[in-house]
Interface confidence: medium
């Protein structure tokens, strides 16, 4: 092909090229064909005769103002045609005659201000009608029943002000599962109009200036329809009273999507009407008071998103939102609950009673005042499910004996990002008989008891990442009740002593992280005692991240027992030379981290073992040697080998001797070294 | 208000020890951790450690540890910076420093505290 | 330890114009802990920016921080007087903290 687009099954991209015309020398079996961002201004149908398998043509972001009839023609099996971003702005009734076999057609961003005549009548097969961000100032799409398939018509961002019954009947054979009307200037919803439509299962009227009276005339056109999705995103709903929603009463809504409203007064039974609500979006927006009897009715909601729903109005404490005791005592389905991001001033003792059903409850970044967890905070949710609580950025500096006591369901618990600051007794979790998980990374300090984890021996993921851990190397370890444990993460605390029965026991690890810490004094020989050996036993470890640690020195027994070990992240350490043997016992290892240490040498008795059935190597920025005896062997294998080694060429370069230095350590000629045989395997 | 007050500056001969003090007021000694920063002339900031004055517990840069020596008394509200064996590489200026939240960023600094090493 | 480098070394503008000084560390900083601190000749420190794009009590709307990952802004978006000095970036993500080198913003 003597145009640049590229050609792989069946699909040819022509994209961005600058092409003026159509290609007409590509694989005449093409199926798939984008042509979008060149500076077509017209698509001859002649040129596409060759193409006649086409099942999808995108000629988006182009100059084209006439579409000719005859391409459909030669186009029989086409079922997605995007004209997005071109410069139509008439349509006739030929321009898609032929077009019989659409399923898609994308309109969007061109110039058409009307619709004259039928131009649709054809496309009996059309599922989705994309004419949104030209000029329409009706949704008048023809004059006789037609589109019987349609399932989608998008009209966002148009000048559309009224919508009509005789202008939306042509789609009284239609079941309408998207009415897109976004982003226009609708002032009126004249009676019927929304039942001139065979069937309107979702309406979607975000950025619409609709306020709470004409919201209100909406929902009674909605009544006796089929909506189950009704979308009213920023349409200036600033308050909502117990009519507001009345029409939906005879409607089986599932989905209501009241975000970005400003919405600052929701009236007691404001949603009464709504038995069968399942989906509730509420986020962002400006409530000042939830009223006890606001969330009434909403017997059937399972997810609840009241993210950024509750801001304070100044800096003044007057100012703070509130949120009546039992609340959402009415909310009896209600599985998922976000309430991050908001002003809440604290939890109160019924804040969240009646909860029956909840699994999931997101309060991160959710309260202005919550610095102390007591036995009290979570009293509301004794008789909840709670499967993930989430606590997250919430300036909590204490957790009191028993705060989750309540929460015997709880299986992920989420303290990370907080300022707690404080010695763990090990009664903070009592109660916790079914967790799998704590997050406490990124708090202020942790100082450990041999009883910490005492009360939790179910847990499998343990979190402490940067909480300055205190008294890790405490003998009995605090660690030694957590048999089931298979996550440790230990990381960025500049750890300086552990002891060696740190992990006994803990034989069920599977991953460990203890980067970013100061552990090279353990492994010295010189260590007072000698080192210590802190990985034994772990003979289910799958990876182990031993990054910036400053070690200088490895034990040659060190990984002995981990035999399951699949990554071993070793970088930015000052290690130069390796035991023989170290990593004989690694049969799984699958990737090797070395990068930024001091490494000259790379040889078989040290690496053989490690490299054999790896498919991932890091050895970026190091000093290699490339003399014979330290990287002849290391040199063959990298020829050989199909294991990835990223950067292979720019980053693996060689430090001595001097006329070597910077040279590619993959181009160090190995054929005048003794004993450079084939690389053996 | 809030604030620490460092020490006099000093000058001392290399191998001498030296300790300097800084002391909390305004505010609850123990609630905040507090971190020592170097500044050699002419040069930028280097974060040497932090202690917890409520029970003393210590963190140290792994390019300060076994250098200096940081510990605090609680009961006068004070944090102590410490050397055994001064070296004239140790001339610098030193700030005690609060640190604030999570730990980490310093919302409150002494003064500083001069030291000079010099034969 | 995590390096932080910061770029330019001077930046050499006049009163009222825009600031915009860059801080990239060497690893990737997944959660946030980024402050930026003011410092003028003979005095200590000053906190601006923690968290990567908070403002801290007391320090004018001007000052303004962004970024994440490696790479972190602090834009001054119209220069007065009393801000030229050295500004210095800080990482707490590890609790090894380290200091950028500093930028030095000076009277052109």
């Known amino acids: 092909s003597t145009t640049k687009c590229t050609v792989s099954h069946e699909v040819a991209d022509c994209s961005h090229l600058k092409l003026t015309q159509v290609p007409d020398d590509l694989p005449t079996n093409i199926t798939v064909l984008n042509l979008t961002h060149n500076q077509l201004r017209r698509l001859p149908a002649a040129n596409f005769t060759r193409y006649s398998q086409l099942t999808s043509l995108d000629v988006g972001f182009n100059t084209i103002s006439k579409l000719e009839p005859e391409l459909c023609q030669k186009l029989p099996m086409l079922k997605v045609l995007n004209l997005q971003h071109n410069e139509l702005s008439q349509l006739s009734d030929k321009t898609f005659a032929f077009c019989t076999n659409l399923t898609e057609l994308h309109l969007m961003s061109n110039s058409i201000q009307k619709i004259k005549n039928n131009p649709f009548v054809k496309q009996k097969n059309l599922i989705t009608l994309d004419l949104s961000h030209n000029g329409l100032s009706s949704t008048k799409l023809g004059t006789q029943v037609q589109l019987e398939n349609l399932q989608e018509l998008l009209l966002s961002n148009n000048k559309i002000q009224a919508l009509k019954s005789e202008e939306l009947d042509i789609f009284a054979n239609s079941s309408l599962k998207k009415l897109e009307l976004s982003s226009n200037q609708i002032k009126e919803f004249s009676p019927g109009c929304f039942h001139a439509i065979g069937r309107l299962f979702g309406l979607f009227l975000n950025n619409v200036q609709l306020g709470p009276s004409l919201t209100e005339k909406l929902c009674l056109e909605l009544a006796n329809t089929s909506i189950r999705n009704l979308s009213l995103s920023n349409s200036q709903l600033s308050t909502t009273s117990n009519t507001t929603f009345l029409g939906l009463k005879w409607t089986n809504l599932t989905m209501l999507d009241l975000s970005y409203n400003n919405l600052n007064v929701v009236g007691n039974d404001s949603f009464a009407w709504l038995p069968q609500l399942e989906y509730f979006f509420l986020e962002y927006n400006n409530i000042q008071h939830l009223f006890s009897h606001s969330l009434h009715g909403l017997f059937n909601v399972r997810y609840l998103n009241l993210k950024r729903s509750f801001t304070k109005q100044s800096i003044s404490l007057a100012s703070l939102p509130k949120i009546d005791d039992f609340s959402f005592q009415w909310l009896k389905c209600l599985e998922h609950l976000n309430m991050e991001d908001n002003d809440i001033p604290g939890i109160k003792s019924n804040m969240f009673t009646g909860l029956i059903n909840l699994k999931y409850l997101s309060l991160s970044n959710s309260f202005t005042s919550l610095r102390t967890l007591t036995n009290e905070t979570f009293v509301s949710l004794a008789h909840s499910p709670l499967h993930i609580l989430n606590l997250t950025k919430n300036k909590i500096s204490k957790i009191e004996s028993d705060a989750f006591s309540w929460l015997g369901h709880l299986e992920v618990l989420d303290l990370g990002l907080n300022e707690i600051g404080q010695e763990l007794t090990g009664q903070e979790w009592r109660g916790l008989e079914n967790i799998f998980e704590i997050y406490l990374s990124y708090n202020k300090y942790l100082q450990l008891t041999r009883n910490s984890f005492a009360l939790v021996p179910s847990l499998q993921r343990l979190m402490l990442r940067r909480v300055a851990l205190k008294n890790v190397d405490s003998s009995p370890s605090p660690f030694q009740p957590l048999r089931n444990l298979t996550i440790l993460d230990l990381s960025n605390n500049n750890i300086a002593n552990i002891n060696d029965d740190m992990l006994e026991g803990l034989e069920k690890l599977e991953i460990l992280d203890l980067q970013h810490n100061n552990l090279a004094r353990l492994w010295k020989h010189a260590n007072p005692g000698g080192p210590i050996y802190f990985l034994k036993g772990l003979s289910h470890l799958h990876i182990l991240n031993l990054e910036s640690n400053g070690f200088d020195e490895i034990p040659v027994e060190v990984f002995k027992d981990l035999f399951e070990l699949k990554i071993i992240d070793l970088g930015l350490n000052n290690l130069n030379t390796l035991p023989a043997s170290v990593f004989n016992n690694q049969v799984s290892l699958k990737s090797l981290n070395l990068q930024k240490n001091l490494i000259t040498s790379v040889e078989k008795k040290v690496f053989g073992p490690a490299f054999r059935n790896l498919t991932e190597l890091d050895m970026r920025f190091n000093p290699f040697d490339c003399t014979c005896e330290s990287i002849a062997w290391f040199v063959n294998w990298i020829n050989e080998t199909h294991t990835n080694i990223p950067e292979l060429s720019s980053h693996y370069l060689c430090n001595t001797p001097p006329h070597y230095h910077g040279f590619p350590v993959r181009l160090f000629d190995t054929s005048s070294c003794k004993d450079s045989a084939p690389f053996e395997l | 208000g809030v604030e620490l007050v460092q020490s006099g500056a000093e000058v001392k001969k290399p191998g001498e020890s030296l300790k300097i003090s800084c002391k909390g007021s305004?505010?609850?000694?123990?609630?905040?951790?507090i971190s020592w920063v170097r500044q050699a002339p002419g040069k930028g900031l280097e974060w040497m450690g932090v202690?917890?004055?409520?029970?003393?517990?210590?963190n140290y840069a792994p390019s300060f540890q076994g250098q200096v020596t940081i510990s605090a008394d609680k009961s006068i509200s004070t944090a102590y910076l410490q050397w055994s064996s001064l070296k004239a590489s140790d001339t610098a200026m030193y700030y005690c420093?609060?640190?604030w939240g999570i730990g980490g960023m310093v919302d409150i600094w002494g003064q500083g505290t001069l030291v000079t090493v010099s034969s | 330890d995590i390096v932080l480098t910061q770029s330019p070394a001077t930046l050499s503008l006049s009163p009222g114009e825009r600031a915009t000084l860059s801080c990239r560390a060497s690893?990737?900083?997944?959660?946030?802990?980024l402050a930026w601190y003011q410092q003028k000749p003979g005095q200590a420190p000053r906190l601006l920016i923690y968290?990567?794009?908070s403002r801290a009590t007391g320090v004018p709307a001007r000052f303004s921080g962004s970024g994440s990952g490696t790479d972190f802004t602090l834009t001054i978006s119209s220069l007065e007087p009393e801000d030229f000095a050295v500004y210095y970036c800080?990482?707490?993500?590890?609790?090894?903290?380290?200091f950028g080198q500093g930028t030095k913003v000076e009277i052109k």
């Open positions: 420093a609060r640190e």
């Open positions: 305004g505010y609850s000694f123990t609630d905040n951790w």
């Open positions: 202690i917890d004055p409520s029970d003393s517990y210590t």
């Open positions: 690893q990737y900083i997944d959660i946030s802990y």
């Open positions: 968290d990567a794009s």
């Open positions: 800080q990482q707490y993500y590890s609790l090894s903290i380290t």
